[in-house]
Interface confidence: medium
């Protein structure tokens, strides 16, 4: 599924991401935009042999199990394919674990490079939340 901007903002808010660990909803929507272009089925392969999955591009070396990433930790204890569902529950629950890990949203390269320090509230402007 490819979410609309406001549709995703509403879904993320419903799942408790607004101000989760101090990160406003705009940060999460911005991260999703630049990680996956709001596409729940996005997959991208990394040079270390791992793969990033889903709307928040969660990595198989650390967070999920895709059955083929050497030394996978699977810290979210889920199959990576669950992160590709049109229901973002699994991605949100795993993202909450990631953002609580110590580096906050810096764990997402796209957030660090494209969202951090910008007017992230623009990503939810005009949305009925």
């Amino acid at each position: 599924k490819v979410f609309g901007r406001c549709e995703l903002a509403a879904a993320m808010k419903r799942h408790g991401l607004d101000n989760y660990r101090g990160y406003s909803l705009g940060n999460w929507v911005c991260a999703a935009k630049f990680e996956s272009n709001f596409n729940t089925q996005a997959t991208n392969r990394n040079t270390d042999g791992s793969t990033d999955y889903g709307i928040l591009q969660i990595n198989s070396r650390w967070w999920c199990n895709d059955g083929r990433t050497p030394g996978s930790r699977n810290l979210c204890n889920i199959p990576c394919s669950a992160l590709l569902s049109s229901d973002i529950t699994a991605s949100v629950n795993c993202a909450k674990k990631i953002v609580s890990d110590g580096n906050g949203m810096n764990a997402w390269v796209a957030w660090r490079n494209r969202c951090k320090g910008t007017d992230v509230q623009a990503w939810i402007r005009g949305c009925r939340l």
Epitope: Q41, T43, G49, D66, G67, R68, P70, P79, L84
Partner: antibody
Framework: QVQLQESGAEVMKPGASVKISCKAT????????IEWVKQRPGHGLEWIGE????????YYNEKFKGKATFTADTSSNTAYMQLSSLTSEDSAVYYC?????????WGQGTTLTVSS | DIELTQSPATLSVTPGDSVSLSCRAS??????LHWYQQKPHESPRLLIK???QRMSGIPSRFSGSGSGTDFTLSINSVETEDFGMYFC?????????FGGGTKLEIK
């Protein structure tokens, strides 16, 4: 136990298309990548690409882009590879395998012969 | 693409001999290297994963070693059922690639 059952041998004319199937049993089909491998005598094994059945995500070896197309039907736990514009160079045994990085589980292979 | 070069192309041995098969990668692939045996008209069979981890059911005479670019499959005291083709495969990056194979034949 994990099993991959491929469709039977095919004899096709040059220029035609063929669709090979790979039915998976014994594991959660949507969770693992299915990979496709080509074997020709004297050419060893070549990785064609992969599909994640749960999402339909695909990756192709550059060499096979435009030649192979992967699909999957999660209702029947079956992956498919279509090969188009067949030539004699496509005559080979084609294997599906479960993508664990390594390949512990293989289909029995589908022999494709392209001949006029 | 990562190229895997296997040597020798053919190895002629007598049952009871011990042999070493080589697989060399064109760049470092850590331990992401796997070994297969293939008999005529059969699918490949995984022997060793991640350079040195023997798969369940594989006889202990098979062992793997190496890391980086140089890998070895050793067969201690070859048995008649061991004859066939041996391939290495890397999973360090895409596209996945295989070596050209080593044919183990009876002398």
């Amino acid at each position: 136990q994990v099993q991959l059952q491929e469709s039977g041998a095919e004899v096709m004319k040059p220029g035609a298309s063929v669709k090979i199937s790979c039915k998976a049993t014994g594991y959660t089909f949507t969770t693992y990548w299915i990979e496709w491998v080509k074997q020709r005598p004297g050419h060893g094994l070549e990785w064609i690409g992969e599909i994640l059945p749960g999402s339909g995500s695909t990756y192709y070896n550059e060499k096979f882009k435009g030649k192979a197309t992967f699909t999957a039907d999660t209702s029947s736990n079956t992956a498919y590879m279509q090969l188009s514009s067949l030539t004699s160079e496509d005559s080979a045994v084609y294997y599906c395998a479960r993508g664990d990085g390594y390949y512990c589980y293989w289909g029995q292979g589908t022999t494709l012969t392209v001949s006029s | 693409d990562i190229e895997l070069t296997q040597s020798p192309a053919t190895l002629s041995v007598t049952p009871g001999d011990s042999v070493s098969l080589s697989c060399r990668a064109s760049q470092s692939i850590s331990n992401n290297l796997h070994w297969y045996q293939q008999k005529p008209h059969e699918s490949p069979r995984l022997l060793i994963k991640y350079a040195s981890q023997r798969m369940s059911g594989i006889p202990s005479r098979f062992s793997g070693s190496g890391s980086g670019t140089d890998f070895t499959l050793s067969i201690n005291s070859v048995e008649t059922e061991d004859f066939g083709m041996y391939f290495c495969q890397q999973s360090n990056s895409w596209p996945r690639t295989f070596g050209g194979g080593t044919k183990l034949e009876i002398k």
